[in-house]
C-alpha cells in the first residue's frame, strides 16, 4: 500500500514538475527590467528564451522573436538545450511511469518489470529535474554577471551631456517557476526510485524440501508454497510465497497474448 502511494505520489509530483518545466520554458519572463533606478517607467522590458517583449504603460505589449540561431549567445542556446532535454526526458519518464504504476494493470506484467520501469522513470525524472535546475541556474548566473557589468558602465557619457543607459535585467518569474518545477521533478524521481525498491522482488529463493516416497517423485509443498516438480531453485527468481493468498496475476503464470504490449 505504502509502495503504491509512494509511486503514485512520485508520479503526480513529477507530472506537476514537468508541467512547470514546460511552462517555464515557454514563459517570456526569464529576465525582467530592473526598476530600481526608475520605478515608474513608461516602458517595461522582459525577455524569454524565445522572444523579448516590451509592455508600455498603456498596457500595449509587443513581442519580437529571436529569429536568428547563430547570432544568439552560446549560453542562451545551452539553456534552451537543457530545458528541451529536461522536457523530453520528463515526457518519456511520464510515459514509462504510467505503465509502471502499480494501480494500472497491463496484462500480466510482472512486478519485476514494473520495478524496472519505475526505476527507469525515476532516473529520467531526476535527470530531467537536474537539467531544468541547471538551465535556470545558468541563465540566472548569466543575468547576475550582466547585471553587474551593466551597473559598472551604467552611464557612458556622450559629450558629458547625453546619457545612454543600458537596460539592466533582473530575475523573472520563469526562473522561480523553473527552479520549483525542477525541484519537484527531482523529488518525484527520487520517490519513484524509492517505490522501485518496494516493488522489486526479494532475492530470497524458497527451495522446496522433497521427500522420496516409493513410486513417483513428488515435491512436498508446505502450505502457502506453490507446488513445484523437481529440486531446482526458482529460476525466474520470483517470490513464490504469498501467505496463502493468490492474486489474479499469479494464477495466470504462463505468457498470454496480453503480456506483450
Amino acid at each position: 500500500m505504502a509502495v503504491t502511494a509512494c509511486q503514485g505520489l512520485g508520479f503526480v509530483v513529477s507530472l506537476i514538475g514537468i508541467a512547470g518545466i514546460i511552462a517555464a520554458t515557454c514563459m517570456d519572463q526569464w529576465s525582467t527590467q530592473d526598476l530600481y533606478n526608475n520605478p515608474v517607467t513608461a516602458v517595461f522590458n522582459y525577455q524569454g528564451l524565445w522572444r523579448s517583449c516590451v509592455r508600455e504603460s498603456s498596457g500595449f505589449t509587443e513581442c519580437r522573436g529571436y529569429f536568428t540561431l547563430l547570432g544568439l549567445p552560446a549560453m542562451l542556446q545551452a539553456v534552451r538545450a537543457l530545458m528541451i532535454v529536461g522536457i523530453v526526458l520528463g515526457a518519456i519518464g511520464l510515459l514509462v511511469s504510467i505503465f509502471a504504476l502499480k494501480c494500472i494493470r497491463i496484462g500480466s506484467m510482472e512486478d519485476s518489470a514494473k520495478a524496472n520501469m519505475t526505476l527507469t522513470s525515476g532516473i529520467m525524472f531526476i535527470v530531467s529535474g537536474l537539467c531544468a535546475i541547471a538551465g535556470v541556474s545558468v541563465f540566472a548566473n548569466m543575468l547576475v554577471t550582466n547585471f553587474w557589468m551593466s551597473t559598472a558602465n551604467m552611464y557612458t557619457g556622450m559629450g558629458g551631456m547625453v546619457q545612454t543607459v543600458q537596460t539592466r535585467y533582473t530575475f523573472g518569474a520563469a526562473l522561480f517557476v523553473g527552479w520549483v518545477a525542477g525541484g519537484l521533478t527531482l523529488i518525484g524521481g527520487v520517490m519513484m526510485c524509492i517505490a522501485c525498491r518496494g516493488l522489486a522482488p526479494e532475492e530470497t529463493n524458497y527451495k522446496a524440501v522433497s521427500y522420496h516416497a516409493s513410486g513417483h517423485s513428488v515435491a512436498y509443498k508446505p502450505g502457502g508454497f506453490k507446488a513445484s516438480t523437481g529440486f531446482g531453485s526458482n529460476t525466474k527468481n520470483k517470490k513464490i510465497y504469498d501467505g496463502g493468498a493468490r492474486t489474479e496475476d499469479e494464477v495466470q503464470s504462463y505468457p498470454s497474448k496480453h503480456d506483450y504490449v
Epitope: 515608474v40 498596457g59 509587443e62
Partner: antibody, heavy 119, light 112 residues
Framework: QVQLVESGGGVVQPGRSLRLSCAAS????????VHWVRQAPGKGLEWVAV???????NYNSALKSRFTISRDNSKNTLYLQMNSLRAEDTAVYYC?????????????WGQGTLVTVSS | DIVMTQSPLSLPVTPGEPASISCRSS???????????LYWYLQKPGQSPQLLIY???NPASGVPDRFSGSGSGTDFTLKISRVEAEDVGVYYC?????????FGAGTKLEIK
C-alpha cells in the same frame, strides 16, 4: 466620431480649487488611457497626469501633491481636481486620448479649457 | 526628467521647399527592444496638438507622406519634403520612454 470636450475652466484666486471635466464620446474610457496636458500662454506643452483603462494612474511628480485625476465610467468623463492653485498653473488644459492596443501615444486631443489663476 | 531640446525655434520656409526640424534628448530613447520612444506633434494656430509621427519614424493615420521622421537614440529629425501653407504651426517633439513624458520647446514653422 471621436471627441474630447473639456470644461470647468475659468478665473480662480490663488490657493483656491477647481475641478476640470473632460467628456469623451466616440470611445469608452474603459478601453483607453486619457492624459491631461497643459500649455501656459505662449509656452510649450507640459504633461500633468494620466489615468489608464484599468484605473492605474501616473502623475507628474512636480504636481502630484496638488492635482488628482479621476474618472466616472458611467458618464464616460474624466476629471482633474486642482487644489492650492498658483499663478504658474495658469494654462490651457487639454485632455488627450491614448490607445491601449497600439503603439501610438496621445492620438486625439480636446480643444482645451483655459484656467487663469489671478487675484 | 529627460530634457528635450529643439532647434531652430523659428523656421521660415518657402512653399514647395523642404524643411527640417531637429530634436535632441538628454538620454537615449532607444529601448532594448529596438523601438525609439520619440513622437512628433503639430499644433496649428488656434488648435490643439495633433499626432504626426509615433516611435520616431511611423506616420500616424491621415498624415501626408511628405512628413517623415528619422534619427538615432538621441538625435532626431522631422523632415517635410515640400512645405505647404497648411503645414504652418508649432512642431513639438516628445519622449515617452520615461515618466514624466516631456516635450521640446517647439519649433514655429512660418511661410516666407
Amino acid at each position: 466620431q471621436v471627441q474630447l470636450v473639456e470644461s470647468g475652466g475659468g478665473v480662480v484666486q490663488p490657493g483656491r480649487s477647481l475641478r476640470l471635466s473632460c467628456a469623451a464620446s466616440g470611445f469608452s474610457l474603459t478601453n483607453y488611457g486619457v492624459h491631461w496636458v497643459r500649455q501656459a500662454p505662449g509656452k510649450g506643452l507640459e504633461w500633468v497626469a494620466v489615468i489608464w483603462s484599468d484605473g492605474r494612474i501616473n502623475y507628474n511628480s512636480a504636481l502630484k501633491s496638488r492635482f488628482t485625476i479621476s474618472r466616472d465610467n458611467s458618464k464616460n468623463t474624466l476629471y482633474l481636481q486642482m487644489n492650492s492653485l498658483r499663478a504658474e498653473d495658469t494654462a490651457v488644459y487639454y485632455c488627450a486620448r491614448h490607445p491601449a492596443f497600439g503603439p501610438h501615444a496621445m492620438d486625439y486631443w480636446g480643444q482645451g479649457t483655459l484656467v487663469t489663476v489671478s487675484s | 526628467d529627460i530634457v528635450m531640446t529643439q532647434s531652430p525655434l523659428s523656421l521660415p520656409v518657402t512653399p514647395g521647399e523642404p524643411a527640417s526640424i531637429s530634436c535632441r534628448s538628454s538620454k537615449s530613447l532607444l529601448n532594448s527592444n529596438g523601438n525609439t520612444y520619440l513622437y512628433w506633434y503639430l499644433q496649428k494656430p488656434g488648435q490643439s496638438p495633433q499626432l504626426l509621427i509615433y516611435r520616431m519614424s511611423n506616420p500616424a493615420s491621415g498624415v501626408p507622406d511628405r512628413f517623415s521622421g528619422s534619427g538615432s537614440g538621441t538625435d532626431f529629425t522631422l523632415k517635410i519634403s515640400r512645405v505647404e501653407a497648411e503645414d504652418v504651426g508649432v512642431y513639438y517633439c516628445m519622449q515617452y520612454l520615461e515618466y514624466p513624458p516631456t516635450f521640446g520647446a517647439g519649433t514655429k514653422l512660418e511661410i516666407k
